[in-house]
Interface confidence: medium
């Protein structure tokens, strides 16, 4: 079976003009998934991103996340890239205040 992930992108304010953007994938199966941040379409280097492990979410499916810090005002340059079971999608950082974007493939 294949269950596509829900993708949720959030921003949280941090100091000195930087914000943390977090991309969460949840409710997917099987466990193998690709999740990475891209800037202007290019994947960020590994050492600028922080990942959570892929863990059960209690419903027979899985969840994970990836986060990175970016300059406030440059949100539109960043997207979260997701690949799962042959499907893939790109999810933008929400503009404006601390918002959440949720999408279902």
């Amino acid at each position: 079976r294949t269950v596509p992930p829900m993708v949720n992108v959030t921003c949280s304010e941090v100091s000195e003009g930087n914000i943390t953007v977090t991309c969460r994938a949840s409710s997917f199966y099987p466990r193998n998934i690709t999740l990475t941040w891209r800037q202007d379409g290019v994947s960020l280097s590994h050492n600028t991103q922080q990942w959570g492990d892929v863990l059960p979410d209690g419903n027979g499916t899985y969840q994970t996340w990836v986060a990175t810090r970016i300059r406030q005002g440059e949100e539109q340059r960043f997207t979260c890239y997701m690949e799962h079971s042959g499907n893939h999608g790109t999810h933008p950082v929400p503009s404006g205040k601390v918002l959440a974007l949720q999408s279902q493939w």
């Epitope: 690709t34 492990d53 690949e83």
Partner: antibody, heavy 119, light 108 residues
Framework: QVQLQESGPGLVKPSETLSLTCTVS????????VHWIRQPPGKGLEWIGM???????DYNAAFISRVTISVDTSKNQFSLKLSSVTAADTAVYYC?????????????WGQGTLVTVSS | EIVLTQSPGTLSLSPGERATLSCTAS???????LHWYQQKPGQAPRLLIY???NLASGIPDRFSGSGSGTDFTLTISRLEPEDFAVYYC?????????FGQGTKLEIK
């Protein structure tokens, strides 16, 4: 720094169980999973299986009837048990960390331990 | 099971030359899940390139990777003496997570 160290008996008799431990430092067992891989002398690499941070396991179907991978977080150790061994199980056995964001690549390896199966 | 076939089995080159190593998968592999490892005699493998084209930490930029689908390539632009080793491709696209049989890069 990140380190993994395999240990266990270097000689195992046919039909017995091979038991190895992988002691890790420099990272948390609750944050990273571990793979076990083996390499017969003069040959290539073979993936045995892995354990995720929640303790669930994925095994190579070629070993599934006789392999067990587990974790003891209190000792910072992962373990591999392979039952009913034969001479074909003679190999260098490696543990390797499952990297985050490396899409399950193995980003740090132990130095390996040679296990010989012989009577 | 996805079978990875590496070619050539042995590659004999001199320092300073360019090396091109090939990895062909028996069925399509996501580029995210195709990795390369380097192994020197008596040592454990080390991660060289992850996700087809990304250099692992501490790997010099004379190494590069490319490819998609079933055909992947590892290139070393200018061989240094320490590059002579065995190279393995590895897929984590579908269990069991297989390795190629290796390409031995030796000094000519």
């Amino acid at each position: 720094q990140v380190q993994l160290q395999e240990s266990g008996p270097g000689l195992v008799k046919p039909s017995e169980t091979l038991s190895l431990t992988c002691t890790v430092s420099g990272f948390s067992l609750t944050t990273y999973g571990v793979h076990w891989i083996r390499q017969p002398p003069g040959k290539g690499l073979e993936w045995i299986g892995m354990i995720w941070t929640d303790g669930t396991t994925d095994y190579n179907a070629a070993f599934i009837s006789r392999v067990t991978i587990s974790v003891d977080t209190s000792k910072n150790q992962f373990s591999l048990k392979l039952s009913s061994v034969t001479a074909a199980d003679t190999a260098v056995y490696y543990c390797a960390r499952k990297g985050h964001g490396y899409y399950y690549a193995m980003d740090y390896w132990g130095q390996g331990t040679l296990v010989t199966v012989s009577s | 099971e996805i079978v990875l076939t590496q070619s050539p089995g042995t590659l004999s080159l001199s320092p300073g030359e360019r090396a091109t190593l090939s990895c062909t998968a028996s069925s399509s592999v996501s580029s995210s899940y195709l990795h390369w490892y380097q192994q020197k005699p008596g040592q454990a493998p080390r991660l060289l390139i992850y996700s087809t084209s990304n250099l692992a930490s501490g790997i010099p930029d004379r190494f590069s990777g490319s490819g998609s689908g079933t055909d992947f390539t590892l290139t070393i632009s200018r061989l240094e003496p320490e590059d002579f080793a065995v190279y393995y491709c590895h897929q984590y696209h579908r269990s069991p997570f297989t390795f190629g049989q290796g390409t031995k890069l030796e000094i000519k």
